[in-house]
């Protein structure tokens, strides 16, 4: 009788479909993620079962608190989909899918440097480019450690490119480009370049 | 080239033990499922058990207990253990490989081994 | 225990023909596709035909195909051909009483 009145349960809103979930969303491979399987009732003693595709990955007991599955993506393939199973007695639904997006960190990105020298200006072009990584990628260029042009995406493998132009300074500068893409918290930098001060003939970077 | 190879089958006597080996190669255990299966002589196939990726096993009800799926990684070896055996378990066993995370898409088979109990 | 039922056990039918098998389980197959189907010839391991339940597998003629969802399937051979003359087996797979997996008993298809 109680298995019927679970059932029963089902088909109205106490006992709803589960919810599957991760803090995390975009991974990078040999990343280790946990899944939480959770439900609305916290009354009930529930079995939980995750899957991914046509496979079976583990199953946890219960009640009030979510299940956590924890996983590491180490395989394209483990990018999902996931879908988690909520059981009571002989009764059962499923969450919606779940899947991860794999994304390759960005290697530290190479900055490469032109400058148009005037009398009284320095026209400089501040090209960056990260060889490895998943796209799209986001490039910002520093001076002296501040930023100085907005988040430039490329959605293709080129450099981003940002000029700009300065009265011939009297002092050193030092340029540096970041590359980020959708890992969060995962940036990378150039090695900096530094453009030294006017005064005789140094500017390595000038086209004559 | 992708494969399997059974081993270990042969003649046993009633409540002896058999140890079946499957042997794959061109491809790693840690991403796919091994499958045992079995069909006696004139009959159907019959799913036995199951190990995944992971290292889960699966049996059938009547396999449950008897039987015990396990593998060695650094081999890339699955094994059938089977206690207790008796006259019906008299059958061709073939172990089959699963699609990647499909369990039991199997595309992969092996060519069988042949266990025969009796006295 | 899941109980997969096939039909017929044997059919017997002349190259052109088309041949319809059906597989009936007990209890609905996880994510109501988790069917596949096989080809079994004498002394030879089971080949994979079908799987999702209508997915053709690789090197598999178009002549095969798959249909169904839940608990009924069916598997078509469109145009007999002579080397299509084997058994037939459906394997379901199950979440309700643990992960499991339950084949058909056969269907035998044979030269009228």
């Known amino acids: 009788r109680k298995a019927v009145l679970d059932c029963e349960a089902m088909k109205t809103n106490e006992f709803p479909s589960p919810c599957l979930d991760s803090k995390t969303k975009v991974v990078m491979k040999g990343q280790n993620v946990s899944m939480f399987c959770s439900h609305k009732n916290k009354s009930l003693q529930i079995t939980y079962s995750l899957f991914r595709r046509k496979t079976h990955l583990g199953t946890q007991d219960g009640k009030g608190e979510p299940a956590i599955f924890n996983l590491s993506i180490t395989e394209a393939h483990e990018s999902g989909p996931y879908k988690c199973k909520a059981q009571v007695t002989s009764c059962s639904k499923y969450s919606r899918d779940f899947s991860f997006t794999i994304v390759d960190p960005v290697t530290s990105p190479v900055l490469n440097i032109m400058v148009i020298q005037t009398e009284t200006d320095r026209h400089i072009t501040l090209h960056c480019l990260s060889v490895n990584g998943s796209l799209p990628i986001n490039y910002t260029f520093f001076e002296n450690h501040v930023a100085i042009s907005p988040a430039i995406s490329k959605y293709d493998r080129e450099p981003a490119e940002f000029n700009l132009t300065k009265k011939n300074p009297g002092e050193e500068e030092e340029y540096r480009c970041e590359a980020k893409n959708r890992l969060p918290n995962y940036a990378t930098y150039s090695h900096p370049v530094t453009m030294p001060s006017t005064g005789g003939d140094s500017c390595p970077f000038c086209l004559k | 080239e992708v494969q399997l190879v059974e081993s270990g089958g042969g003649l046993v006597q009633p409540g002896g033990s058999l140890r079946l080996s499957c042997a794959a190669s061109?491809?790693?255990?840690?991403?796919?499922?091994i499958t045992w299966v079995r069909q006696a002589p004139g009959k159907g196939l019959e799913w036995i058990g199951t190990?995944?990726?992971?290292?889960?096993?699966y049996y059938s009800t009547w396999a449950k207990g008897r039987f015990t799926i396990s593998r060695d990684n650094s081999k890339n070896t699955v094994y059938l253990q089977m206690n207790s055996l008796r006259a019906e378990d008299t059958a061709v066993y073939y172990c089959?490989?699963?699609?990647?995370?499909?369990?039991?898409?199997?595309?992969?088979w092996g060519q069988g081994t042949l266990v025969t109990v009796s006295s | 225990d899941i109980q997969m039922t096939q039909s017929p056990s044997s059919l017997s039918a002349s190259v052109g023909d088309r041949v319809t098998i059906t597989c009936q389980s007990s209890?609905?197959?996880?994510?109501?596709?988790?069917l596949s189907w096989y080809q079994q010839k004498p002394g030879k391991a089971p080949k994979l035909l079908i799987y999702?339940?209508?997915r053709l597998a690789s090197g598999v003629p178009s002549r095969f195909s798959g249909s169904g969802s839940g608990t009924d399937f069916t598997l078509t051979i469109s145009s007999l051909q002579p080397e299509d003359f084997a058994t037939y087996y459906c394997l379901g797979g199950y979440d309700s009483s643990g992960w499991y997996a339950a084949f058909g008993q056969g269907t035998k298809v044979e030269i009228k």
């Open positions: 089959a490989r699963g699609y990647v995370d499909s369990d039991w898409y199997l595309n992969i």
């Open positions: 190990i995944n990726s992971y290292g889960n096993t």
């Open positions: 209890e609905s197959v996880y994510d109501n596709n988790y």
């Open positions: 999702d339940a209508s």
């Open positions: 061109g491809f790693s255990l840690t991403i796919y499922t």
